[in-house]
Interface confidence: medium
């Protein structure tokens, strides 16, 4: 499981795909379909929320069509018969381009976001609790399908006594011009993926954004240290984590850990007392061999601000500091979705965390 209480994601499923939604649809459940529209074949794809695998009962049929200028059809099928179509004449997908498609189930409707932007609301025509299956077909390649139960993914600083039970909700529609997804690493351009921006306020909560929207900074007191939070859905190829902060003037060391259960899959440990950036993995309380090589001088400086950008790829983590590549760390724990906890501690003050 990627995180307790939520269904593990389907990773790189073949299309056509049909998979069970464990426990069926529930109010507040968010389902993310991440993939790429094929540029070569076909003019349509569809995501269906249905009862069983037959395709005769589809509560919500979401069907982008690259025809007649592009449009999206939404519909419901009952006992093999389609109802009236609802058409959206705007086409938010592009052939050959990655996408992040999020469905939020609410009591009255499905809210659909494409690449972080609210695209359409589809009001329920049949009771959504009958839905137990998601299917995807057509001209699309899938990276993953993930499930997020809002009651199981708190943003929880260490030692906090505040209960975290606010529902996760879609962000307000961003104002102004929407940016296109970033071309991040050339060999495998990162699709836009759901991001949590962690803020520490009187009632800590969470807000969703995407790497397509520049990181937003919110006024907040200093993050409690150590800082511990859940990584929604765990790691997967293209997942980005961004942290920024300031090194304390008298700093000796700090660490950023990506954890899986009791294991530390990735331990990033800048040491000012050794002028080194140590990387390692701890499995069952046993450390492996350290990695210390750097392509340039120690990028962390006492008293100075920094940002660390961690990109997960299939074989390794890529780490940049202040926008410049620092090293690659090849996965030693390879069950990426189980790496679902971020821990930060030591001689820094955190100003921003985005997972």
């Amino acid at each position: 499981m990627a995180f307790s209480g939520s269904q593990a994601p389907y990773l790189s499923p073949a299309v056509p795909f049909s998979g069970t939604i464990q426990g069926g649809l529930q109010d507040g459940l968010q389902i993310t379909v991440n993939g790429t529209v094929l540029s070569s074949s076909g003019t349509r794809f569809a995501v269906n929320f249905q009862t069983g695998f037959s395709g005769n009962d589809i509560a919500f049929h979401f069907n982008p069509r690259f025809e007649d200028g592009g449009y999206v059809v939404c519909n419901t099928r009952q006992n093999g018969s389609w109802g009236p179509e609802e058409r959206k004449t705007h086409m938010p997908f592009q052939k050959g381009m990655p996408f992040d498609l999020c469905f939020l189930v609410q009591s009255s409707d499905f809210k659909v976001m494409v690449n972080g932007i609210l695209f359409v609301q589809y009001f329920h025509r049949v009771p959504f609790h009958r839905v137990d299956t998601i299917s995807v077909n057509g001209s699309v390649q899938l990276s993953y399908i993930s499930f997020q139960n809002p009651r199981t993914v708190p943003v929880q600083p260490a030692f906090s006594t505040v209960p975290f039970s606010q529902p996760v909700c879609f962000p307000p529609r961003p104002r102004g011009r929407r940016q296109k997804p970033p071309g991040v690493w050339p060999a495998n351009p990162a699709p836009i993926t759901q991001t949590v921006i962690h803020t520490v306020q009187s009632a800590p909560g969470q807000m969703f954004s995407t790497p397509a929207i520049p990181p937003m900074m919110y006024p907040h007191p200093a993050y409690p240290m150590p800082f511990i939070t859940t990584i929604l859905g765990g790691l997967y190829p293209s997942k980005s984590i961004l942290l920024s902060g300031t090194v304390l003037p008298s700093a000796q060391r700090f660490h950023i850990n990506l954890c899986s259960g009791n294991h530390i899959a990735f331990h990033l440990n800048p040491r000012f007392d050794e002028n080194a950036v140590v990387r390692n993995t701890q499995i069952d309380n046993s450390w492996g061999s350290e990695e210390r090589s750097l392509p340039r001088k120690m990028p962390f400086v006492r008293g100075q601000s920094f940002s660390v950008w961690i990109l997960c790829e299939a074989h390794c983590l890529k780490v940049a500091v202040d926008g410049q590549h620092l090293f690659e760390y090849y996965h030693r724990l390879r069950n990426l979705p189980t790496i679902n906890r971020l821990e930060v501690g030591g001689d820094i003050q955190l100003t921003h965390v985005q997972t």
């Epitope: 991040v184 050339p186 990181p215």
Partner: antibody, heavy 117, light 107 residues
Framework: EVQLVESGGGLVQPGGSLRLSCAAS????????IHWVRQAPGKGLEWVAA????????YYADSVKGRFTISADTSKNTAYLQMNSLRAEDTAVYYC??????????WGQGTLVTVSS | DIQMTQSPSSLSASVGDRVTITCRAS??????VAWYQQKPGKAPKLLIY???SLYSGVPSRFSGSRSGTDFTLTISSLQPEDFATYYC?????????FGQGTKVEIK
């Protein structure tokens, strides 16, 4: 699609000033280093300055330090190069480039700056 | 500052030839070296990063290697579209520095 578009070049007298703009789109502007690189007529590439918008960290070549100022407006996804006390040897095509982690992966088309009396 | 000394400054070659361009760093830059191709009137294009990694979309006839502070760009079989000027660049730390360039001309 990642795009960088420079503007603001032109003819200026020695000692004069000019401000170049680099409008970026298609990526998360504040996460990448933005560089200015110039190329004098018939010469090679010379790195001029860079900024990391996320923290507004700036870097300069010795040849322009104290005369040029690099800045960025993350709300406009635009980087600027303010050039003061211009000299004849500053005549060049000025490119802005995105500092990909491993170098400069996207470049603008360039804008020509001519310093002459 | 780290200096990048590139050689040769120019070379003449024929289609199908194997071409090698070298760059020497004045001090250790680890593998933080990139190679670019530039054609007249155009912006440079990234070919190689991290000394030996091929940038997305670049033909596999281009390759890079490192030996200590010496860096090499190799074109295994020169094609008509490869006639251009090539630059190395180090990004170990600011100031970022380029080599002087190597112009590859038709023999």
């Amino acid at each position: 699609e990642v795009q960088l578009v420079e503007s603001g070049g032109g003819l200026v007298q020695p000692g004069g000033s000019l401000r170049l703009s680099c409008a970026a789109s298609g990526f998360t502007f504040s996460w990448y280093v933005i560089h200015w690189v110039r190329q004098a007529p018939g010469k090679g590439l010379e790195w001029v300055a860079a900024i990391y918008p996320y923290h507004s960290k700036t870097y300069y070549a010795d040849s322009v330090k104290g005369r040029f100022t690099i800045s960025a407006d993350t709300s406009k996804n635009t980087a600027y190069l303010q050039m003061n006390s211009l000299r004849a040897e500053d005549t060049a095509v000025y490119y802005c480039a995105r500092g990909y982690w491993y170098g400069m992966d996207y470049w603008g088309q360039g804008t020509l700056v001519t310093v002459s009396s | 500052d780290i200096q990048m000394t590139q050689s040769p400054s120019s070379l003449s070659a024929s289609v199908g030839d194997r071409v090698t361009i070298t760059c020497r760093a004045s001090q250790s830059v680890s593998s933080a070296v990139a190679w670019y191709q530039q054609k007249p009137g155009k912006a440079p294009k990234l070919l190689i990063y991290s000394a030996s990694s091929l940038y997305s979309g670049v033909p596999s006839r281009f390759s890079g290697s490192r030996s200590g502070t010496d860096f090499t760009l190799t074109i295994s079989s020169l094609q008509p579209e490869d006639f251009a000027t090539y630059y190395c660049q180090q990004y170990t730390d600011a100031p970022w520095t380029f080599g002087q360039g190597t112009k590859v001309e038709i023999k």
